[in-house]
Structures are given as C-alpha cells and as structure tokens.
Interface confidence: medium
Amino acid sequence: PEPPTACREKQYLINSQCCSLCQPGQKLVSDCTEFTETECLPCGESEFLDTWNRETHCHQHKYCDPNLGLRVQQKGTSETDTICTCEEGWHCTSEACESCVLHRSCSPGFGVKQIATGVSDTICEPCPVGFFSNVSSAFEKCHPWTSCETKDLVVQQAGTNKTDVVCGPQDRLRA
C-alpha cells in the first residue's frame, strides 16, 4: 500500500507511517515502528505537557516568585501549568501574571477609565479617535486633540492615539 501523506487526529507522520501522539501529561520516548507503538512516559513532579504531543521534554511548571509579590493560585499538574496570582492588595501586570503592581499604569495610547481602589485595579481604555495619551500613567485620562481651528490655525500633522495634532499657520497664498 501507498505510504500515508496525512494522519488522523492525535497521530503524526514519521518515516512514512502514522504514529500515535503522546497524551497530555506524557512525553515522547520513542516513535512507533512497523511493529511497536509510540512509547511515552509521564512528566516528572514539577513538569507538564498540556496537549497531545511528540515533545521529548516536558515543560517546567511556572515558578511564582515571592520576591515579585507572586503566590500560587492553582498548583500545576502533569497536564496543566501552575497559575500564579499576586499577594493581597497587589495586581497582576498582565494576564500571564508574571509580576505585581500596587496598581497598574495605562500605556501610551490608553487612558484611565477608572482609578484603582483598595480592592480593584486601574481600568484602562483605548483612546478613541480625537483623543490621545502620550504617557504611561495610573491616573491620566485620554486628552482631546488640540483644536487648531479655534486658534485660527490649521492641522499640519494629524494626531494619533499617542500624539496630539500639530497646528500651524494658515496658508496665506490662497486666491
């Protein structure tokens, strides 16, 4: 028979044959052959693999570094990574929660929708058209672009979500 060019779900193609992938929580030891099944081994104590895979090494569980204000929210298993969270009163800087801040700043291009309180973190929002923020701030809202017209000037450079418009003098040479 013709060697396969594609395999079923949870299989992979190697040496012109389809081998079973290792299940989550296990790593690949050896590929299948004509006569043997794929050989897999469970991940070690502080390791995991969260997909059907052909990885030869498991991933290390995330370390929740107390020096960064982190603690374990959910202990990892052979199939899942450890989930970190911040100490009481602190907030994660990102969804991955790799470090903690007392309250988060909104990056340039974003403004503060709601200032942090003792229990909730800063809420940021993207600056809409007509507004900008050029600073990283835990307090500042998006500012409206300068209105050149009210100063009897014209827009020389358009504004963005991170920059104000640049105004300049009217062109006096118009007929």
Partner: nanobody, 116 residues
Framework: EVQLLESGGGLVQPGGSLRLSCAAS????????MQWVRQAPGKGLEWVSA????????YYADSVKGRFTISRDNSKNTLYLQMNSLRAEDTAVYYC?????????WGQGTLVTVSS
C-alpha cells in the same frame, strides 16, 4: 542606578504637620509620575498620592484628601508631601515610588509617628 531617598519623618502630635521629601537620582525625573505610598504597622501598603511628571496634576487617596499636598521640584529632582492635620491613623512608614511594582524602585522609607 535608580535611587530614592526619603526624609522628614518623625514624631508629631495629632493635629500637627510634617513635610516629607524624596530626593531622586538615576533617571530623568520629570518624565515620571511619582507617588507616595505608606505602610502602617502590621498592615499592607496603601497608596497615598501621586503627581504627574510636569507637576500640574495631582491625585489623592480619600483618606488624605484635603489634608495632604503632593508637589515636586523638577529642577531639584525632589518630590514632597506636605501633611497637615495629622491623625493617629496616619502613623506609617512613607515611601516615595517611581513605579508601583513589587520591589520596584522603592526608597527605604521614612517613619511618621502621630501620637500624643
């Protein structure tokens, strides 16, 4: 290397005043929003006040609004906190901070004790 050095703490009677200073070095001071944060004995950190890089915008926790005033002198790379009408519950170590990350650019703090 970023350095923040707080001073001006001490023992004061309820109703009294103190002015804290924070001398900053190792970064372009006027580019950064600066903050005061405090930690009362046995309690967690509490944000107190912040000021924009240009000094025009100030922000306060409800617990200190109307009593404390934050200011800065960018020519001297110094942040200030004027504390009036002090209360026993203002007793804490006061830190100035450039960022509010855990162990991020904190000074060593200055102790303010309000007691009769």
């Amino acid at each position: 290397e970023v350095q923040l050095l707080e001073s001006g703490g001490g023992l004061v009677q309820p109703g009294g005043s103190l002015r804290l200073s924070c001398a900053a070095s190792g970064f372009t001071f006027e580019w950064y929003e600066m903050q005061w944060v405090r930690q009362a004995p046995g309690k967690g950190l509490e944000w107190v006040s912040a000021i924009s890089g240009d000094g025009y915008r100030t922000y306060y926790a409800d617990s200190v609004k109307g009593r404390f005033t934050i200011s800065r002198d960018n020519s001297k790379n110094t942040l200030y906190l004027q504390m009036n009408s002090l209360r026993a519950e203002d007793t804490a170590v006061y830190y100035c901070a450039k960022e509010l990350g855990y162990f991020d650019y904190w000074g060593q703090g200055t102790l303010v004790t309000v007691s009769s």
